[in-house]
Interface confidence: medium
């Protein structure tokens, strides 16, 4: 709406950088034949580039990352009773981010 | 997998709280009626409950919100030219979190 | 305060029966899956049995299997731990516990413990 | 049944450091958990998930495992330190304990 502006601040873009997001652990990254097992914990966070850049024809993308494995319980149903192991999940975090030119092919005349 | 233990770190729950998250501001926000024009900036941070709970039958939700109006410059392109006018979009910040139970519906028997 | 009150416990002659409780307070009791430990005098922990945070899975140690039944009420805040059939080799103090997720892990709070003794 | 063997005692010097082991098989497969226990009192949680430290558990105590053995590891031992220490693992549809290890510091 174009009313109550006095009370409004100005916004400010929100920059390209790291920011901590939620991830969500899917079971498929575990174990893709068998889904009789449940994964805790269900989410971690990791950090991802976000944010606007100046430009339109620039994007936020991470220029650096890092693998960082982490080990997550597998919570096996065998005969309605759990049986508990180890599992490695390999998150990626940007480490850091750039607005980066996103080249759109021009169609062919 | 559950190979290369040893140098995984135990994975940690991102628990239920307020996260930074970033927010794309949609030309329909400000105006419905017409597609002829910009906005800037095009994307700022919100406070957003984001992570996981300990149970499986609650979720993260946000449990005290509060609005927050913002002014951004709507960039309307007249005769080719821009014309630059304010506008306030209304955004909505997370203040605090609580998991929450989810009501499932039980089959009817 | 955070914390578990066992009582029921007793002396009992063998092959008689007994139900201990277990309150909980200062947190949310249905969001936690629950065990009874038990320790005979002088002996180390022995597991004794486990349920959800919602009474849908409960399990036992071979030694009890058959003769104790675990079970909770979440409206009351209350664990129960119904001992039936009670041999000499029962006599223990029972702890019970609290795991901090719904499926289990580690026991991060304790109650004091109620002695239990079958003799005749 | 699956069992954990830890050694009946250990004893070591003020401000030296003790090692305390749980051997079982495949054991670095599961999660280790170690409590305290002093006597006439209720046990307490001092590593859970082979590494983790309880919040109000001094730093001076950590923990390991891998292969078949867990390891709770006491640096610069205090004298209200004296207590059973029992390692615990969930395997097979069972909270398993091992027998406990008496750790003495010596006077």
């Known amino acids: 709406s174009l009313g109550s502006l006095a009370a409004a601040e100005p916004a400010v873009i929100a920059e390209c950088k790291t920011r901590t997001e939620v991830f969500q652990i899917s079971r498929n990254l575990i174990d893709r034949t068998n889904a009789n097992f449940l994964v805790w914990p269900p989410c971690v966070e990791v950090q991802r580039c976000s944010g606007c850049c100046n430009n339109r024809n620039v994007q936020c993308r991470a220029s650096q990352v890092q693998m960082r494995p982490v080990q997550v319980r597998k919570i096996e149903i065998v005969r309605k009773k759990p049986v508990f192991k180890k599992a490695t999940v390999t998150l990626e975090d940007h480490l850091a981010c750039k607005c980066e030119t996103v080249v759109t092919p021009r169609p062919v005349t | 997998s559950l190979g290369s233990l040893a140098a995984a770190e135990p994975a940690v729950i991102a628990e239920c709280k307020t996260r930074t998250e970033v927010f794309q501001i949609s030309r329909n926000l400000i105006d419905r009626t017409n597609a002829n024009f910009l906005v800037w900036p095009p994307c700022v941070e919100v406070q957003r409950c984001s992570g996981c709970c300990n149970n499986r039958n609650v979720q993260c939700r946000a449990s005290q919100v509060q609005m927050r109006p913002v002014q951004v410059r709507k960039i309307e392109i007249v005769r080719k030219k821009p014309v630059f006018k304010k506008a306030t979009v209304t955004l909505e910040d997370h203040l605090a979190c609580k998991c929450e139970t989810v009501v499932t519906p039980r089959p009817v028997t | 305060e955070v914390q578990l009150v066992e009582s029921g416990g007793g002396l009992v002659q063998p092959g008689g029966s007994l139900r201990l409780s277990c309150a909980a307070s200062g947190f949310t009791f249905s969001s936690y899956a629950m065990s009874w430990v038990r320790q005979a005098p002088g002996k180390g922990l022995e597991w004794v049995s486990y349920i959800s945070d919602d009474g849908s899975l409960k399990y036992y140690a071979d030694s009890v299997k058959g003769r104790f039944t675990i079970s909770r009420d979440n409206s009351k805040n209350t664990l129960y731990l119904q001992m039936n059939s009670l041999r000499a080799e029962d006599t223990a103090v029972y702890y019970c516990a609290r795991h901090p997720y719904w499926y289990g892990g580690q026991l991060d709070l304790w109650g004091q413990g109620t002695l239990v003794t079958v003799s005749s | 049944s699956y069992e954990l063997t830890q050694p009946p005692s250990v004893s070591v010097a003020p401000g030296q450091t003790a090692r305390i082991s749980c051997s079982g098989d495949?054991?670095?497969?599961?999660?280790v958990h170690w409590y305290q226990q002093k006597p006439g009192q209720a046990p307490v949680l001092v590593i859970y998930d082979d590494s983790n430290r309880p919040s109000g558990i001094p730093e001076r105590f950590s923990g390991s495992n891998s292969g078949n053995t867990a390891t709770l590891t006491i640096s610069g031992t205090q004298a209200e330190d004296e207590a059973d220490y029992y390692c615990s693992a969930f395997t097979h549809n069972s909270d398993v304990f091992g027998g406990g290890t008496k750790l003495t510091i010596k006077r």
């Open positions: 495949s054991l670095g497969s599961y999660f």
